[in-house]
């Protein structure tokens, strides 16, 4: 076809000075020599469609997709990516070829896909297709461990599908409650994948590699313990393994344990029992309920019954997708300068979340604590009484959650002043937001009691610094006050603060600061 333009598609790889920081398109990046993507006409396509060679990009790399068009006259263009139109500004190079570019900075999964470029020239219309994918990178991960039964043995294997392969350890504790904290002397650690001693009070498996440490607790119902006020609940996703341990101690061996799901006995092969005598000659029995890969119909009340103990139940809920349940409405707090205070978020989530607290673009570690009612709580106390906006962000495999908090610190105003040739301005960040008065100091009013009301302009929130509101008041210069000292005062329920300014002075000239409680 004589009318078809000569088209060249190229890929330009940019070497970012730091691949871990996003760059704006104006950022000077070192470019490698362009790679020809050989735009070929796609056969059997409706319309004129050119297809560039597939582009593989490293995560965090920056690239430019570029089309050079040798066609007479002007061209107009439009980029389309995932059904969204993107701006397109063609320009001409020294050889008078039309140049159209798409810059992708700091490549991520979300930027992978098909980029369509529609070009309209005076002679014809045509489409160019680029397919951009992320290069098969190695993603080191650390995943929560899970349990499997060891073949032909009454033992549990702990598995964490992580890279590098993690160091696996069992964390065992035989006392109750607080004494089972990680560094307690009651805690025993065994650096092995298989555990045979399954009678302990508290059994956890932990996996660690250079990304951190993740633990999973063996869900246990203890028939000798008083049941919780709320029914224990266990969430699992379809396909995950289910493990519940029922434990009971009795003076002799004359008792048995059974599992039921919704009043029906568990099928053979979905449970196994172990028993042992303890040091005081009492009998300990444990009965495991397990399903190697759960389905929706495994949801329900699992009840462990004993011939010598009251039965106890747990609700197992199988979900298709993970979730994070919490109220995301923003919360505002007002505290005194030395008042102890923590932000807290109460949530129910599965799988376990990872979270961060952020203030002033700085992220802080986030700790979670499980509550008895199946909820978890995360608290943040390290605000150092800095007012502003605090953000809690949580995510797991399937869900994301963000909650905003505003912290206001009650304190009396601190005033800063500046003056120009035409006006004087005062600023204050006290809370509650202060009110303003302006006073003129003259022979008639040496104590500056003569109030100025004309030409005053108050702004309640001049600038918002990470949620911190600043109040300002501006006095426009008039002949009546030129050459005089004026005083601006900010006051709130906690006190007053003033600043004296000599008007008509060149540039900022704060004169005296008065702190009046």
């Amino acid at each position: 076809n004589q009318d078809l333009p000569v088209i060249k598609c190229v890929l330009i790889n940019h070497k970012n000075n730091d691949s871990s920081v996003g760059k704006s398109s104006s950022y000077p990046m070192v470019s490698e020599s362009p790679e020809d993507l050989g735009c070929a006409l796609r056969p059997q396509s409706s319309g004129t469609v050119y297809e560039a060679a597939a582009v593989e990009v490293d995560v965090s790399a920056s690239i430019t997709l570029q089309v050079l068009v040798d066609a007479p006259g002007n061209i107009s263009c439009l980029w389309v990516f995932k059904h969204s139109s993107l701006n397109c500004q063609p320009h001409f190079d020294l050889q008078n070829r039309g140049v159209v570019s798409m810059v992708i900075l700091k490549m991520t999964e979300t930027q992978a896909g098909e980029y369509l470029l529609f070009i309209q020239s005076e002679a014809t219309n045509y489409t160019i297709l680029f397919t951009v994918s992320i290069r098969n990178t190695l993603l080191y991960t650390l995943r929560r461990p899970y349990f499997r039964k060891m073949e032909n043995q009454d033992a549990l294997v702990c598995i964490s599908e992580s890279v590098p392969e993690p160091i696996v350890e069992w964390v065992l504790c035989d006392s109750q409650g607080e004494s089972c904290k990680e560094e307690s002397p009651a805690v025993v650690k065994k650096e092995e994948k298989v555990l045979h001693e399954l009678f302990g009070t508290d059994i956890r498996c932990c996996a660690r590699n250079e990304l951190g440490r993740e633990c999973t607790r063996l869900f246990t119902i203890d028939l000798n313990q008083t049941p919780q006020t709320t029914l224990p609940q266990l969430f699992l996703k379809v396909g995950e393994p289910l493990w519940i341990r029922c434990k009971a101690v009795h003076v002799n061996h004359g008792f048995g344990l059974t599992w039921e799901l919704e009043n029906k006995a568990l099928e053979e092969g979905n449970y196994f029992e172990m028993s042992t005598y303890s040091t005081n000659r009492t009998m300990i029995r444990i009965l495991f309920a397990f399903v190697s890969s759960v389905a929706r119909n495994d949801t329900g009340y699992y009840t462990c019954s004993s011939s010598k103990h009251p039965s106890q139940s747990a609700l197992v809920t199988i979900v298709e997708k993970g979730f994070i349940n919490a109220t995301n409405s923003s919360e505002d707090y007002e505290i005194d300068q030395y008042e102890e205070f923590c932000f807290s978020v109460r949530f129910k989530a599965y799988p376990q979340i990872r979270c961060t607290w952020t203030f002033s673009r700085k992220s802080f570690p986030c700790e979670q604590k499980g509550l008895d009612n199946g909820y978890s709580i995360s608290k943040f106390c390290n605000h150092k009484h800095q007012p502003g906006e605090y953000i809690f962000h949580a995510e797991n495999d399937d869900a994301q959650f963000t909650k905003m908090f505003t912290l206001n610190i009650r304190r009396k105003p601190q005033v800063l002043a500046e003056a120009s040739a035409s006006q004087a301005s005062c600023f204050s960040d006290g809370y509650p937001l202060p009110s303003w008065t302006w006073k003129k100091c003259s022979d008639k009013s040496p104590n500056c009691t003569e109030e100025i009301t004309e030409g005053v302009w108050n702004r309640k929130a001049n600038r918002k610094v990470f949620g911190q509101w600043v109040s300002s008041s501006t006095l426009n210069m008039s002949e009546a006050i030129k050459g005089f000292l004026v005083k601006c005062c900010a006051y709130n329920s906690l006190g007053t603060s003033c600043e004296t300014i000599l008007l008509n002075s060149p540039g900022p000239f704060p004169f005296i600061q008065d702190n009046i409680s």
């Epitope: 490293d58 990178t137 190695l138 890279v163 250079e210 797991n396």
Partner: antibody, heavy 129, light 107 residues
Framework: QVQLVESGGGVVQPGRSLRLSCAAS????????MHWVRQAPGKGLEWVAV????????FYADSVKGRFTISRDNSKNTLYLQMNSLRAEDTAVYYC??????????????????????WGQGTTVTVSS | EIVMTQSPATLSVSPGERATLSCRAS??????LVWYQQKPGQAPRLLIY???TRATGIPARFSGSGSGTEFTLTISSLQSEDFATYYC?????????FGGGTKVEIK
Amino acid sequence: QVQLVESGGGVVQPGRSLRLSCAASGFTFSSYGMHWVRQAPGKGLEWVAVISYDGSNEFYADSVKGRFTISRDNSKNTLYLQMNSLRAEDTAVYYCARGGEITMVRGVIGYYYYGMDVWGQGTTVTVSS
Amino acid sequence: EIVMTQSPATLSVSPGERATLSCRASQGVRNNLVWYQQKPGQAPRLLIYGASTRATGIPARFSGSGSGTEFTLTISSLQSEDFATYYCLQHNSYPLTFGGGTKVEIK
């Protein structure tokens, strides 16, 4: 540009201690795992230790476990290797190298790992009486 | 620990010829394997990660293959600057381990 500079090497007697430092620049140090690797004269490379991006986890080669400690100060963009109870077989050029970059993928923390992609020029440690 | 065995220890090749270097793991390491090049008096340089992906700026004549326990680094046409020692490293499990190295020298 991205750079790692080791220091602290020298001649030391067996049984004594030495601390190596590695100053990082040109990248967000706190987002990367960091490694120490050594090379005895005329021999191959030996991995020594790794520390996670936030300093919370360390792993060591069996030959140095219990004697060497890897640590980092993200506020100073510096990696350290504290070497105690030094032996003649610890004589080597010690390199620090950049590991994986931290990321969050659907609630799972991960590193995009391209191998140890940036290396320092090395610092020489000689253990001799 | 996983033992990485490289062969041959020395490879004599003429410029322009093909060089094939082997690295074997005592246990499977999936594709968690990296190749480095080192010249005398210099720090190692990353060539290949993920067993087969060329690092940024590495010429196309270098290619990696393999998975599990058997890995190969191929230099299709040796240039004068390619004469050096090559190391493989597994990072599938701790401790990370290097192979003993293959020295590629001019024939």
